[in-house]
């Protein structure tokens, strides 16, 4: 059965300067390959977080993604600014050269409220 990417919240609201959690769970880790978070869609989408060795300021994983059975790929964005508003997608890739996108969550829209 094909892996499914579940983003339970359609939208979240957060006050500027606060933190927010964007939830994402997978139904399987197979096929092997990375999971990445993007804001927006298409060619202009912006990489927000990758569950590899890269480090992203203000964005951290919520659960221990080094667990071999981990299916929780939620992230926390800290010190949110108005520029962080947009729709965030949790995306599963199959390994390759380059990696191939095989499934995306439905997206979570982040609304940033004035402090």
């Amino acid at each position: 059965t094909e892996v499914k990417v579940i983003q339970p919240e359609k939208s979240v609201s957060v006050a500027a300067g606060d933190s927010t959690v964007l939830n994402c769970t997978l139904t399987s880790l197979l096929p092997v390959g990375p999971i990445r978070w993007y804001r927006g869609v298409g060619q202009s989408r912006q990489l927000i977080y990758s569950f590899t060795t890269e480090h992203f300021p203000r964005v951290t994983n919520v659960s221990d993604a080094t667990k071999r059975s981990n299916l929780d790929f939620s992230i926390r964005i800290s010190n949110v600014t108005p520029e962080d508003a947009g729709t965030y997608y949790c995306v599963k890739f199959q390994r390759g050269s380059p990696d191939t996108e095989i499934q995306s969550g439905g997206g979570t829209e982040v609304y940033v409220l004035a402090k």
């Epitope: 880790l29 197979l30 096929p31 092997v32 990375p34 569950f51 590899t52 060795t53 221990d64 993604a65 080094t66 667990k67 071999r68 059975s69 390994r95 050269s97």
Partner: antibody
Framework: DLQLVESGGGVVRPGESLRLSCAAS????????MSWVRQAPGKGLEWLAG????????YYIDSVKGRFTISRDNSKNSLYLQMNSLTAEDTAVYYC???????????WGLGTLVTVSS | ALTQPASVSANPGETVKIICSGG??????YGWYQQKSPGSAPVTVI????KRPSDIPSRFSGSASGSAATLTITGVRVEDEAVYFC???????????FGAGTTLTVL
């Protein structure tokens, strides 16, 4: 500079126990899963056990399950391997290794030699 | 089990390919580990199929397809003489395995 330094090896008799340590430095130890790998004399590499970054999840090869226990103390930047009921077949150089995000290995320690002999 | 040739040899400057088979592309990632003498610390030359650590020369490259992974050394040097172990992580079983090792001799 990233460093992994094993210690605790030595000569023990069959049936005895030994605890190996691996001191990590030069990286954020608490962010990485870790593993123990051994190499018997004249043989290849054999993965033994792995542990998640937080220490809550552990994984073992069948042949050491129940005898060996992997653990870690992130406050001390240290990884451990408790080995019980040792036999001559456990004679090997034991390496600790840092895991990549997909559970392969990117850095290795220099190893510590364990000899089990009567 | 991972299968790799027991030995390969090459002249300096030649290209060497070492193939490791036995994994499942759907669930397995591969790495390659260099050991210059028995009991010395292994050095990772490739992980995640094709990722080269920053301190490894660019003549080392890796690829994976189907049930096999390949380590390629382009323009092999005398200092590349070593035993090369392929390793794999299986996302189905959560287990790591290694091949028996390939001894590279540079003539």
């Amino acid at each position: 500079d990233l460093q992994l330094v094993e210690s605790g090896g030595g000569v023990v008799r069959p049936g005895e126990s030994l605890r190996l340590s691996c001191a990590a430095s030069g990286f954020t130890f608490s962010s990485y899963a870790m593993s123990w790998v051994r190499q018997a004399p004249g043989k290849g590499l054999e993965w033994l056990a792995g542990i998640s970054a937080g220490g809550s999840d552990t994984y073992y090869i069948d042949s050491v399950k129940g005898r060996f226990t992997i653990s870690r103390d992130n406050s001390k930047n240290s990884l451990y391997l408790q080995m019980n009921s040792l036999t001559a077949e456990d004679t090997a150089v034991y390496y600790c290794a840092r895991e990549t995000w997909n559970h392969l290995f990117d850095y290795w320690g220099l190893g510590t030699l364990v000899t089990v002999s009567s | 089990a991972l299968t790799q040739p027991a030995s390969v040899s090459a002249n300096p400057g030649e290209t060497v390919k070492i193939i490791c088979s036995g994994g499942d592309y759907y669930s397995t990632y591969y790495g390659w580990y260099q050991q210059k003498s028995p009991g010395s610390a292994p050095v990772t030359v490739i992980h995640s199929d094709d990722k080269r650590p920053s301190d490894i020369p660019s003549r080392f490259s890796g690829s994976a397809s189907g049930s096999a992974a390949t380590l390629t050394i382009t323009g092999v040097r005398v200092e590349d003489e070593a035993v090369y172990f392929c390793g794999a992580y299986d996302g189905r079983t959560y287990i790591n395995t290694f091949g028996a090792g390939t001894t590279l001799t540079v003539l």
